[in-house]
Amino acid sequence: MAVTACQGLGFVVSLIGIAGIIAATCMDQWSTQDLYNNPVTAVFNYQGLWRSCVRESSGFTECRGYFTLLGLPAMLQAVRALMIVGIVLGAIGLLVSIFALKCIRIGSMEDSAKANMTLTSGIMFIVSGLCAIAGVSVFANMLVTNFWMSTANMYTGMGGMVQTVQTRYTFGAALFVGWVAGGLTLIGGVMMCIACRGLAPEETNYKAVSYHASGHSVAYKPGGFKASTGFGSNTKNKKIYDGGARTEDEVQSYPSKHDYV
């Protein structure tokens, strides 16, 4: 039961985290105009990974996309790449983890396969979370570096700037969303990896012993599954002997005296 709970919780936490990473990537408020110790402006500037926006005092908001690739700094491109890689890995991880969930039964998938898939998705979530945290941190570092620049324009080299002292940029809401989301995805990934250990069939030192049932041929292997003939009530591949620990949600079944010859 604990393994299923850990796996399920890991999935949910990662799902929330990846949704947050997607939200942060799409948000416009990666950097916002610093209002502290600045002249009071009748406009509020904020910038995202894809466009910059200006909200005027009338409430009118105008956003302009960065329609250039070559004109943007390498750091911004790197942040975009990290966030996209994080989203892609997270999405793949989510897809894999859905099939790996203990509570979902797909065909005759063995626990060992589910364990491997859980581990794979866990690693993907961890890398996804790290990508998001790295991306947000790189952007934050870029902001700190540019904070005291007199031109007050983070994206230098995008055209003739008039010297102004009107705008400095500070951390926007998207950075905090990204950090939290990245952290959640990372935690979810770790939980999936922990769950994987509980799912994996434990190895035993003694050899498999074959028992012959009176009715039809059934083999029992330590840590294995009951061999199904395709008849009767054994089509669900319930584990009947694993030579060790067993989770609460598994159906317990022991060989009866009639199974021995």
């Epitope: 002249p39 009071v40 009748a42 406009v43 500037n45 910038q47 005027e56 009338s58 009118f60 705008t167």
Partner: antibody
Framework: EVQLVESGGGLVQPGGSLRLSCAAS????????MHWVRQAPGKGLEWVSY????????YYVDKLKGRFTISRDNAKNSLYLQMNSLRAEDTAVYYC?????????????WGQGTLVTVSS | EIVMTQSPPTLSLSPGERVTLSCKSS????????????LAWYQQKPGQAPRLLIY???TRESGIPARFSGSGSGTDFTLTISSLQPEDFAVYYC?????????FGGGTKVEIK
């Protein structure tokens, strides 16, 4: 048609108080920020105060802070300017003006003004 | 606060002439966020309220004749009337629309010669 009509002006003694009103019509008043601008006789325009559509933020010209208070009642489509401790230099025509939308913060509609005379 | 300086204070001209009014601000009115200038021009006739002519330094307000045009960026701005009409004799004000307080220039009076 957008209309702004100021009222409440008149003769007041130095140190006295006056409350100016501006009745708005022809537009959704609650969606627009509003300004007060004044013009002393024979002088240029002087911006006084601004209030946003939701009553926050509010801005004043530094020299009038503490004496003048801008407010609005969106239910009544009205803008107000409470003027206290009036001085002779406050004598002017007071205009209310609308903060235009998508006009780079310019004042796109103005009332005809109300004259405030501070004299003993 | 931003100081707006208009020159000349008075211009004596004849109808049909080209008019160029100057406005300088003590600080750049170019907002780097959208690369737009926040400067407006107003026309005021005696006994009337001001009327918005130009916003964003160069955009004509709806209903304003094409003979009025604005230009400039940063700290230096110009209002041009290509061919002065009798109804254009008035006082013209420029205004900083980027920083509070939203200061006005002292005005330029365009009078008939």
């Amino acid at each position: 048609e957008v209309q702004l009509v100021e009222s409440g002006g008149g003769l007041v003694q130095p140190g006295g108080s006056l409350r100016l009103s501006c009745a708005a019509s022809g537009f959704t008043f609650s969606s627009f920020g509003m300004h007060w601008v004044r013009q002393a006789p024979g002088k240029g325009l002087e911006w006084v105060s601004y209030i946003s559509s939701g009553s926050s933020p509010i801005y004043y010209v530094d020299k009038l802070k503490g004496r003048f208070t801008i407010s609005r009642d969106n239910a009544k489509n009205s803008l107000y300017l409470q003027m206290n401790s009036l001085r002779a230099e406050d004598t002017a025509v007071y205009y209310c003006a609308r903060a235009g939308y998508a006009v780079r913060n310019a004042l796109d509609y103005w009332g005809q003004g109300t004259l405030v005379t501070v004299s003993s | 606060e931003i100081v707006m300086t208009q020159s000349p204070p008075t211009l004596s001209l004849s109808p049909g002439e080209r008019v160029t009014l100057s406005c300088k601000s003590s600080q750049s009115l170019l907002n780097v966020g959208n690369q737009k200038n926040y400067l407006a021009w107003y026309q005021q006739k005696p006994g009337q309220a001001p009327r918005l002519l130009i916003y964003g330094a160069s955009t004509r307000e709806s209903g304003i004749p094409a003979r009025f045009s604005g230009s400039g960026s940063g700290t230096d701005f110009t209002l041009t009337i290509s061919s002065l009409q009798p109804e254009d004799f008035a006082v013209y004000y420029c205004q900083n629309d980027l920083f509070y307080p939203l200061t006005f220039g002292g005005g330029t009076k365009v009078e008939i010669k």
